[in-house]
């Protein structure tokens, strides 16, 4: 019950706490459990203590065994004891399992990655973030005291995130990494069959001839992560690359949206140099997801050019 | 109404591969959608995947990397590319085509009688 694991990698710091907790005044005794050895405090020693805390300052493999603890009051002694397992740093980027710190699950609402064991250190911000071994980069992630917060969270955010961080002890600095799982979970998340919210079905749009016109074609397919959401242009019931109107092009990408936690996706049609032969066209909107297909029809009308006789 | 016939289920080794097909026919006029879900014995429905009209494919979770969807738009085909199979894929697997004509407003998945895949040493 008052052991306590814990792992850090060669040429890093590693800190470890007694397990056995007592107030501030308490003094505290460590030892190498295996010769029974005191743990001096003096901090010019690679390994030293320094009350509650076994510093390894920077750890070494052979640093790895059981380590004892003592605390003792006026009135009694509490041991606990700490097994310290120090490894070579990997070559490759994978983590082995027992590196790894407990798993922490994310969603929409909530996306918080705590850097593990980072209270024991010293340190100061910012800390470093990787995910996979990749530097996280752009504006959905964000760096903020002990934990990172990653913004609109994806089922492709789960993964192994890293954090690196300089402890600082006496001016001099040592660099340490934690490593743990994030995964995503839907938070109520639920689908339903596709709402089309623009354009109105059987919609009539006025254009004018000669000009540039678009077509957003909008709809919502449920709440959280959807397995499968689309929406599409079909002109004359077929796909726009068939149809061979270069004038005509569906916007490259959808474009996703999460209005009162909906998730909405939007597809714009752009209509270039709008010819008579436009007005003759059915222009299908589509909204595509497990439940089925819904589709609205809009035709295009001609627009009057505003009189300015007088 | 499109009808669908699906073919390639049979029994491999975990490890191993098998292409399953799915041909439609019936009103197969403005097809917007097909794909494939499956069904192990006293287990839920399990969509695998949907390819668009467009081209544009959507995967579960769980097959991502060892399942791919193509289709033949020219003969109407879909198809499911199962690569390094384990014996938790064993089910029937459905093929499902979503579209019909453009008069219709709201259409839903209709699917095929389905192909046994067992996987098994």
């Known amino acids: 019950k008052f052991s306590k694991q814990s792992w850090g990698l060669e040429n890093e710091a590693l800190i470890v706490r007694c397990p056995r907790q007592g107030k501030p005044s308490y003094t505290v005794d460590w030892y190498y459990s295996q010769t029974n050895k005191s743990i001096p405090t003096q901090e010019r020693n690679r390994v030293f203590a320094s009350g509650q805390l076994l510093k390894f300052l920077p750890a070494a493999v052979a640093d790895s065994g059981i380590y004892t603890c003592i605390v003792r009051s006026p009135t009694f002694n509490r041991t606990g004891y700490a097994n310290v397992t120090i490894y070579k740093k990997q070559s490759d980027c994978n983590v082995p399992d027992y590196l790894m710190y407990s798993t922490v699950s994310g969603s929409e609402k909530n996306s918080k990655i705590y850097c593990p064991t980072i209270d024991l250190y010293n340190w100061t911000a910012p800390l470093e973030w990787f995910k996979n071994c990749q530097a996280l980069q752009g504006s959905r992630y964000r760096a903020h005291k002990s934990f990172l917060v990653i913004d609109n969270v994806m089922t492709e955010d789960a993964g192994d995130y890293t954090c690196k961080f300089i402890h600082n002890e006496n001016g001099a600095n040592y660099s340490v990494t934690a490593t743990r799982s994030f995964t995503v979970k839907d938070e109520q998340g639920f689908s339903l069959f596709p709402v089309i919210g623009a354009p109105a079905q059987n919609e009539i749009k006025e254009v004018e001839i000669g000009k540039n016109a678009n077509l957003t074609c909008s709809a919502c397919f449920g709440k959280g992560t959807q397995f499968l959401a689309a929406v599409l242009w079909q002109l004359n019931g077929t796909k726009i690359t068939d149809f061979g109107e270069p004038r005509i092009q569906q916007e490259e990408g959808q474009n996703q949206s999460f209005s009162n936690g909906l998730a909405c996706l939007d597809m714009v049609l752009r209509i270039a140099d709008v010819k008579e032969e436009d007005l003759l066209l059915q222009y299908d909107c589509l909204a595509l997801n497990l439940h089925g297909l819904r589709r609205h029809t809009v035709r295009l009308s001609r627009k009057n050019p505003i009189d300015h006789h007088s | 109404e499109v009808q669908l016939v699906e073919s390639g289920g049979g029994l491999v080794q975990p490890g191993g591969s098998l292409r399953l097909s799915c041909a439609a026919s019936?009103?197969?006029?403005?097809?917007?959608?097909m794909g494939w879900f499956r069904q192990a014995p006293g287990k839920e429905r399990e969509w695998m995947g949907v390819?668009?009209?467009?081209?544009?494919?959507y995967y579960a979770d769980s097959v991502k990397g060892r399942f791919t969807i193509s289709a033949d738009n020219s003969k109407n085909t879909a198809y499911l590319q199962m690569n390094s199979l384990k014996p938790e894929d064993t089910a029937v697997y459905y093929c499902?085509?979503?579209?019909?004509?453009?008069?219709?407003?709201?259409?839903?998945?209709?699917w095929g009688q389905g192909t046994l895949v067992t996987v098994s040493s």
């Open positions: 499902a085509a979503v579209g019909g004509a453009t008069t219709v407003t709201a259409s839903e998945w209709d």
């Open positions: 390819i668009a009209y467009d081209g544009s494919t």
């Open positions: 019936g009103s197969i006029y403005s097809l917007v959608a």
